[in-house]
């Protein structure tokens, strides 16, 4: 189903409005912001996610990287310009005219410019590290109940084929989470990388996107785990293009 | 401890239809998908489909598309397999299995239900 | 669809002996060295099994005597000193992408 029928509501993202206007009187979403319409059966992607979370109201407000070409989202919040699939545009520019490139998963990849710049095709983010330190406990958690949990919970919370989680790190008390999907991997149907990444950030920081769900509880063998910090680096199949004075700044 | 308990045998006409239920205990219902898995008098395994407990949702394989639908009921915490045109060839033993915890492996089997479908 | 050939498809050895059932995949099933092969047992009337799952890791409460190896396209599983009660028939199976298959089975028995 792509919404659920008795309340019409959208499972999958709460940034959304329903009504039962859909073919003969299905519940069909539309985001906040854009107003396109939305798959409940599955993750809304990041763009359309930032554009809602930009157009509702204003409310109170990242070890080691895996390459130099590594991203870091440090720009945060922005209104992004959509394409009709809902993916980012590959050029994205401000009120004031300031343009720059940005990847799949909408971070930015090269520096600032203006409307003339170019941006040929949107970089495809193929590789993320999530990096997250939990807080203290009693003892350290075995990795392989670990590995399994976080696994599962991609699976059946972000839809992700586990095939996607590349590998599951553990040195007390950073866990690292890699995920991979290359193009060629990446079939119809499939949630994409950076769209379950932003699903994930979003929960462990409390602010879930899933309608009517509880926040996400995260336990190993019945052990809470806790994150206290997470950073999330991007590596995108072209490595990015700064200028020299942003690389040693 | 985790158990998947499913209904009793069925005899069936052809062209009628039968569901299937699996009623799961010992664990939280909504963690993990189920799928269902048949097989044929002395035969080999052959994949269904899955549901997504926590969406409610199914993924079908296309041997069986529009013939196969799989629910869940979280209240109770039962999946559903229901074979619709039913043929002789559809009579075999049929199974839930829950997904495991990593790589989609099939932890846990439901006992086992025999469709005989016959006229 | 990806196909699963086991081999051979019957198979007796001997109390003690090693017995070795083989499983090739029409297409590689691993992913960033994750290989999504599993093994299963089947006793007459009884539901499958789970033996080994990603290849070759030793699902919880089964037998160390049973190992699983291979990556890619070829695997393998390992019977290293055959037991009476491990008479069944053990299929291979991958989860790489669905429809996910099985392989035909193979018939272990004593010799």
């Known amino acids: 189903h792509t919404a659920a029928q008795d309340n019409c509501t959208c499972p999958t993202n709460k940034m959304t409005v329903c009504s039962p206007d859909g073919p003969g009187g299905r519940c069909q979403c539309r985001a906040l912001g854009s107003g396109m319409a939305v798959d409940c059966s599955t993750l809304t992607s990041k763009c359309l996610l930032l554009k809602a979370r930009m157009s509702a109201p204003k409310n109170a407000r990242t070890l080691v990287r895996p390459s130099e070409h590594a991203l870091v989202d440090n720009d945060g919040l922005y209104d992004p310009d959509c394409d009709p699939e809902g993916r980012f545009k590959a050029r994205q520019c401000n009120q004031t005219s300031v343009c720059w490139c940005v990847n799949s998963v909408g971070v930015r990849r090269t520096d600032k410019g203006d409307l003339s710049l170019r941006c040929d095709e949107l970089v495809r983010t193929h590789h993320i590290l999530i990096d997250l330190r939990h807080r203290p406990t009693a003892g350290a958690f075995n990795h392989s109940d670990l590995d399994a949990e976080l696994r599962r919970l991609f699976r059946e919370r972000y839809r992700l084929h586990p095939k996607f989680v590349a590998a599951v790190h553990y040195e007390q008390p950073t866990i690292q989470i890699e995920l991979r999907q290359n193009t060629s991997q990446k079939a119809a149907g499939d949630v994409d990388i950076g769209d379950a990444a932003y699903y994930f950030e979003r929960d462990i920081k409390g602010e879930s996107l899933f309608q009517g769900r509880g926040g996400l509880d995260l336990r190993v063998r019945g052990e809470p785990l806790q994150v206290e910090r997470t950073l999330i680096y991007y590596l995108d199949e072209i490595p990015p293009k700064f200028s020299m004075k942003r690389l040693t700044a | 401890q985790v158990q998947l308990v499913q209904s009793g045998a069925e005899v069936k006409k052809p062209g009628s239809s039968v569901k299937v239920s699996c009623k799961a205990s010992?664990?939280?219902?909504?963690?993990?998908?189920i799928n269902w898995v048949r097989q044929a008098p002395g035969q080999g395994l052959e994949w269904m489909g899955v549901i997504s407990t926590y969406y409610g949702d199914a993924s079908y394989n296309q041997k069986f598309k529009g013939r196969v639908t799989i629910t869940a009921d979280e209240s109770t915490s039962t999946a559903y397999m229901e074979l619709s045109s039913l043929r002789s060839e559809d009579t075999a033993v049929y199974y839930c299995?829950?997904?495991?915890?990593?790589?989609?492996?099939?932890?846990?089997w439901g006992q086992g239900t025999l469709v005989t479908v016959s006229s | 669809d990806i196909v699963m050939t086991q081999s051979p498809d019957s198979l007796a050895v001997s109390l003690g002996e090693r017995a070795t059932i083989n499983c090739r995949v029409s297409?590689?099933?691993?992913?960033?060295?994750?290989?999504?092969m599993h093994w299963y047992q089947q006793k007459p009337g009884q539901p499958p099994k789970l033996l080994i799952y990603?290849?070759?890791n030793l699902e919880s409460g089964v037998p160390d005597r049973f190992s699983g190896s291979g990556s890619g396209t070829d695997f393998t599983l390992t019977i290293s000193s055959l037991q009476a009660e491990d008479v069944a028939v053990y299929y291979c199976?991958?989860?790489?992408?669905?429809?996910?298959?099985f392989g035909q089975g193979t018939k272990l028995e004593i010799k």
């Open positions: 990603r290849a070759s």
């Open positions: 297409e590689s099933v691993d992913s960033y060295g994750n290989n999504f």
């Open positions: 010992g664990y939280t219902f909504t963690d993990y998908s």
């Open positions: 299995a829950r997904y495991g915890d990593g790589y989609n492996q099939f932890d846990y």
């Open positions: 199976q991958q989860s790489y992408e669905d429809p996910y298959t």
